[in-house]
């Protein structure tokens, strides 16, 4: 997208990791076929995406889950992509809510979120859950990732 | 996105094409407002989108279908994008789930998955799904794509 | 992605506004955690994304719902990503469907919309839905972008 | 079962041209990525070209390149390796190969003899 | 291009005992996870036969005395119990990078 050294190309992609965590942000894992072009974007922690350059970002997350209406909370499961910048508050930029299904013992749903957002250097993106133990892991189910216009 | 001779855009999208195969794999047509930058990218045997370049793509698919869950079996409806290249393991890249819906006779739903991946020249991508003949095809409700950073 | 001044980047990225209107068409604000970009990609009349520059996007959108199975019609929720460019006929580019949820008193449900299109000068992209008053447009629940490749 | 036969080499001068074929069988052949290996005469082997399943993508070295074309027929599961301006040292027996990961399944070769 | 340095050339081994062949890429042929090299075996007046795939796996049909090992730039054919239909040509190969390589190949023969 951007060539040569002044512009290199910019972007990541990352895989669900299961967490013995009780935390709602969800875990990631440079395994698998990811995607991490270079040091300036990173994953921090295994949960969150840092990038050095400030710039318009498409960030997007997909998030699958299994869950059954009776054994869940009333509210519905909801996920949400959300930044944390230097100096500055926490804020939500997209969220998607699924209501759980009927299906025993759970049923499976998919969500993806996206968008293109401006990012300041130093910016940290990641990804919160209602209930992370509902969160389904198996190959290409749930993953994270941006990429620098 | 690529500018000059050296860096031409690359990008891709293509429209669902009902199909009377038997197969999992998806089938798409140049067809209604589909897009194709240049020979660099090539829909194959109308089921797979062919890079001749190496390179970061962001690669989506979208899928609607009518699903009914007495009518259909206990496991879910799953999107599959997957990835084929010469002398390489096949790959999933990324899956959805959707249960099934208990509307009559069937219930709609959408999924979408969307990622960046790094392909190698001649690599193919594709889509898999549990039943096609689920699929939808009315317009703009099906369809795949790419586009390269 | 388009560097120096021959080729700036175009990207927006609208968030949802509740309106008394009665219209299928929904409604964005520049409000929150808004990007855009320059005045080569514009928001009219709230309602659509107007670009000034000929060229291949990804367009995206984002919906989410609360609906109830035997509140609403029989027909399911579908979301239209739609265009409209001068002098030419209006185009469905995408299109997503969500039976209604049987959850009371109704049931959320997001859909994720997104493509690679050609676009001309002056061309405007907008989104229909079926029922704007399901719409959510609580923070990041409900938005639409686009970013020139 | 999966069958490959190649057919098509004989004797040419240099310079010369020729087309070799490969008939396949037992497979959805258009599924499948294609290639040409070549062995010269007591000496080891060498890849000669690579075609994707709907031969819209083809690679080949830089020994062969701009003088070799690989192409493919899906409805007639054909595969296709046309030579020109051969020379000496491409003398070999000529197999093609499908396969993913390895090589899994080859003809049993077609010999082009390139010689004055 | 990636070179394939096999080794040795040729190798006697007694009926029953182990035969080793090496092979050496000059970069790594490793790729998410997985290792693209291959093993052959060729006998006189026949096409290669794939014995092993992706450094290790054994392909469907082929006597588990061998196997393969290695990732990175260092691979191993190992012949667990030499027999007299193992006499054959083996060679190496990665699909990696284009141009696909393959070693120089290592004779195989009875002690």
């Known amino acids: 997208m951007q060539k040569g050294d002044q512009n290199p190309q910019i972007a990541a992609h990352v895989i669900s990791e299961a967490s013995s965590k009780t935390t709602s942000v969800l875990q990631w894992a440079e395994k698998g076929y990811y995607t991490m072009s270079n040091n300036l974007v990173t994953l921090e922690n295994g949960k969150q995406l840092t990038v050095k350059r400030q710039g318009l970002y498409y960030i997007y997350a997909q998030v699958t889950f299994c869950s059954n209406r009776e054994a869940s909370s009333q509210a519905p499961f909801i996920a949400s992509l959300c930044l944390k910048s230097p100096g500055r508050f926490e804020r939500i930029l997209l969220r998607a809510a699924n209501t759980h299904s009927s299906a025993k013992p759970c049923g499976q749903q998919s969500i993806h979120l996206g968008g293109v957002f401006e990012l300041q250097p130093g910016a940290s993106v990641f990804v919160n859950v209602t209930d992370p133990s509902q969160v389904s892991h198996g190959t290409g189910f749930t993953s994270f990732g941006l990429l620098k216009l | 996105m690529q500018k000059g001779d050296q860096n031409p855009q690359i990008a891709a999208h293509v429209i669902s094409e009902a199909s009377s195969k038997t197969t999992s794999v998806l089938q798409w047509a140049e067809k209604g407002y589909y897009t194709m930058s240049n020979n660099l990218v090539t829909l194959e045997n109308g089921k797979q989108l062919t890079v001749k370049r190496q390179g970061l793509y962001y690669i989506y698919a979208q899928v609607t279908f009518c699903s009914n869950r007495e009518a259909s079996s206990q496991a879910p409806f799953i999107a599959s994008l997957c990835l084929k290249s010469p002398g390489r393991f096949e790959r999933i890249l990324l899956r959805a789930a959707n249960t099934h819906s208990s509307a009559k006779p069937c219930g709609q739903q959408s999924i979408h998955l969307g990622g960046v991946f790094e392909l190698q020249p001649g690599a193919s991508v594709f889509v898999n799904v549990t039943d096609p003949s689920q699929v939808s095809h009315g317009t703009g409700f099906t369809s795949f794509g790419l586009l390269k950073l | 992605m388009q560097k120096g001044d021959q080729n700036p980047q175009i990207a927006a990225h609208v968030i949802s506004e509740a309106s008394s209107k009665t219209t299928s068409v929904l409604q964005w604000a520049e409000k929150g955690y808004y990007t855009m970009s320059n005045n080569l990609v514009t928001l009219e009349n709230g309602k659509q994304l107007t670009v000034k520059r000929q060229g291949l996007y990804y367009i995206y959108a984002q919906v989410t719902f609360c609906s109830n199975r035997e509140a609403s019609s029989q027909a399911p929720f579908i979301a239209s990503l739609c265009l409209k460019s001068p002098g030419r006929f209006e185009r469905i580019l995408l299109r997503a469907a969500n039976t209604h949820s049987s959850a009371k008193p109704c049931g959320q449900q997001s859909i994720h919309l997104g493509g690679v299109f050609e676009l001309q000068p002056g061309a405007s992209v907008f989104v229909n839905v079926t029922d704007p008053s399901q719409v959510s447009h609580g923070t990041g629940f409900t938005s639409f972008g686009l970013l020139k490749l | 079962q999966v069958q490959l036969v190649e057919s098509g080499g004989g004797l040419v001068k240099p310079g010369g041209s020729l087309r070799l074929s490969c008939a396949a069988s037992?497979?959805?052949?258009?599924?499948?990525?294609m290639y040409w290996i070549r062995q010269a005469p007591g000496k080891g082997l060498e890849w000669v070209s690579t075609?994707?399943?709907?031969?819209?993508?083809?690679y080949s070295p830089d020994s062969v390149k701009g003088r070799f074309t690989i192409s493919r027929d899906n409805a007639k599961n054909s595969l296709y390796l046309q030579m020109n301006s051969l020379r000496a040292e491409d003398t070999a027996v000529y197999y093609c190969?499908?396969?993913?990961?390895?090589?899994?399944?080859w003809g049993q070769g077609t010999l082009v003899t390139v010689s004055s | 291009d990636i070179v394939m340095t096999q080794s040795p050339d040729s190798l006697a081994v007694s009926l029953g005992e182990r035969a080793t062949i090496n092979c050496k890429a000059s970069?790594?042929?490793?790729?998410?996870?997985?290792?693209?090299m291959h093993w052959y075996q060729q006998k006189p007046g026949q096409p290669p036969k794939l014995l092993i795939y992706?450094?290790?796996n054994l392909e469907s049909g082929v006597p588990d005395r061998f196997s393969g090992s290695g990732s990175g730039t260092d691979f191993t054919l190992t012949i667990s119990s030499l027999q007299a239909e193992d006499v054959a040509v083996y060679y190496c190969?990665?699909?990696?990078?284009?141009?696909?390589?393959f070693g120089g190949g290592t004779k195989v023969e009875i002690k």
């Open positions: 190969a499908r396969g993913e990961p390895g090589l899994a399944y």
């Open positions: 037992g497979f959805t052949f258009s599924d499948y990525y």
């Open positions: 075609i994707s399943g709907g031969g819209t993508y083809t």
């Open positions: 970069q790594s042929v490793d790729y998410y996870g997985d290792s693209y």
């Open positions: 992706a450094s290790s």
């Open positions: 190969q990665q699909s990696h990078e284009d141009p696909w390589t």
